[in-house]
């Protein structure tokens, strides 16, 4: 059984969250993909989406969010630059497949943004300078507004819950690790 894990990323204000979601290449390569925030007890809210059909490794920038869909690798890269404390929350990638319900991808991201600068060296930038060298592109296709009731979520359950998906059996498990993502000076 595949486990739908939740990874916790602890970052400082101004840093960049740089994550990836993988998908079944053969099924979803050109499907439209989205980055959503899940607020407790609310419907997931779409913050950014790729074009429809999704273009290969073509960066789409919506405010401080940059999406890059690597069709040939079955990976959606998501960057959230210049993070703010209010960006803290639970995020997920989904694939839009109308008229069917959105397909949730691995993994969910629990983002915790705190004030102050972390001097720890590492893989996430505290400056957005380089990120904006990407030619800014806005989505030509609007992100669909519908969201499946099945994806309405509260905070991850204390006990393991089974969630069925079209592809595989998924166990929703509690957070086991915190990824403290370091920054570049």
């Amino acid at each position: 059984a595949t486990k739908l894990t939740e990874e916790k990323y602890e970052l400082k204000e101004g840093q960049t969250l740089d994550v990836k979601c993988d998908y079944t290449l053969e099924k979803f390569a050109s499907s439209q993909k989205a980055w959503q925030i899940i607020r407790d007890g609310e419907m997931p809210k779409t913050l950014a989406c790729t074009e429809r059909p999704s273009k290969n490794s073509h960066p789409v920038q919506v405010g401080r969010i940059i999406l890059e869909d690597y069709h040939d690798h079955g990976l959606l890269r998501v960057r959230m630059v210049n993070l703010q404390v209010e960006d803290s929350g639970l995020y997920q990638c989904v694939i839009y497949q109308p008229p069917k319900e959105p397909h949730m991808l691995f993994d969910r991201i629990r983002l915790v943004v705190t004030k102050g600068f972390s001097g720890t060296p590492g893989s996430n930038e505290n400056s957005t300078q380089n990120v904006y060298k990407i030619p800014p592109t806005t989505t030509k296709a609007l992100c669909p507004l519908y969201t499946s009731p099945r994806t309405v979520t509260q905070a991850p359950p204390k006990s393991t819950a089974d969630v069925s998906t079209p592809d595989s059996e998924i166990n929703l498990t509690n957070v086991t690790d915190i990824i403290r993502v370091p920054v570049f000076n």
Epitope: T2, K3, K20, Y70, R77, P121, S123, I179
Partner: antibody, heavy 122, light 107 residues
């Protein structure tokens, strides 16, 4: 002990397929990507592709697309890389390497298998 | 694809020498660069990640610097056990590519 243990050397004929295994131990297998890198004798390192052991999804570079299949068996913590339609240029040492967390865009390889020599010869 | 060009392709130095290897990226890769050491007949070993961060357990004589397109790998005082080939690797986008390697020998 945190390690990746690969299967033994193989000799194959052109047109055949080879399946290399990589057994992970000492860490949570499904939490980190597995990557495959090959190295022809006296040559540099060539990244072939990746696999998420949790979802089973994988991707490979254009050069190998259609010829390479990456799979896993989570119950025994083994990743597999199968390369088909072998040709003499595929003669190389094939390495499995652990990547970053499955959700992270951090493609560094901090744990490597010892490599599997695949010789393609008629 | 991003091309990674290492120089020199080989070098010879004496024990105690300061050794520098450079890696040039064909486009801006920010700090998405790693350095590996590969001893003859062995698998590569991660030394530096994200351009400048020393991997756990790696001696402090190894260091890395740079960002954008120009990167440097330094051994502050060469030791006999440092005889190996060194590779840079980027991950700014896909596909991941390695430099062609720098072979280091002792004089």
């Amino acid at each position: 002990q945190v390690q990746l243990v690969q299967s033994g050397a193989e000799v194959k004929k052109p047109g055949a397929s080879v399946k290399v295994s990589c057994k992970a131990s000492g860490y949570t297998f499904t939490r980190y990507d597995i990557n495959w890198v090959r190295q022809a004798t006296g040559q540099g390192l060539e990244w072939m592709g990746w696999m998420n052991p949790n979802s089973g999804n994988s991707g490979s570079v254009q050069k190998f697309r259609g010829r390479v299949t990456m799979t896993r068996d989570t119950s025994i913590h083994i990743a597999y890389m199968e390369l088909s339609s072998l040709r003499s240029e595929d003669t190389a040492v094939y390495y499995c390497a652990r990547g970053g967390y499955t959700s992270s865009w951090r493609w560094y390889f901090d744990l490597w298998g010892r490599g599997t020599l695949v010789t393609v010869s008629s | 694809d991003i091309q990674m060009t290492q120089s020199p392709s080989s070098l010879s130095a004496s024990v105690g020498d300061r050794v520098t290897i450079t890696c040039q990226a064909s486009q801006d890769i920010r700090k998405h660069l790693n350095w590996y050491q590969q001893k003859p007949g062995k698998a590569p070993n991660l030394l530096i990640y994200d351009a400048a961060n020393l991997e756990t357990g790696v001696p402090s004589r190894f260091s890395g610097s740079g960002s954008g397109t120009a990167f440097t790998f330094t051994i502050s005082s060469l030791q006999p056990e440092d005889i190996a080939t060194y590779y840079c690797q980027h991950y700014a986008n896909l596909p991941i590519t390695f430099g062609q390697g720098t072979r280091l020998e002792i004089k």
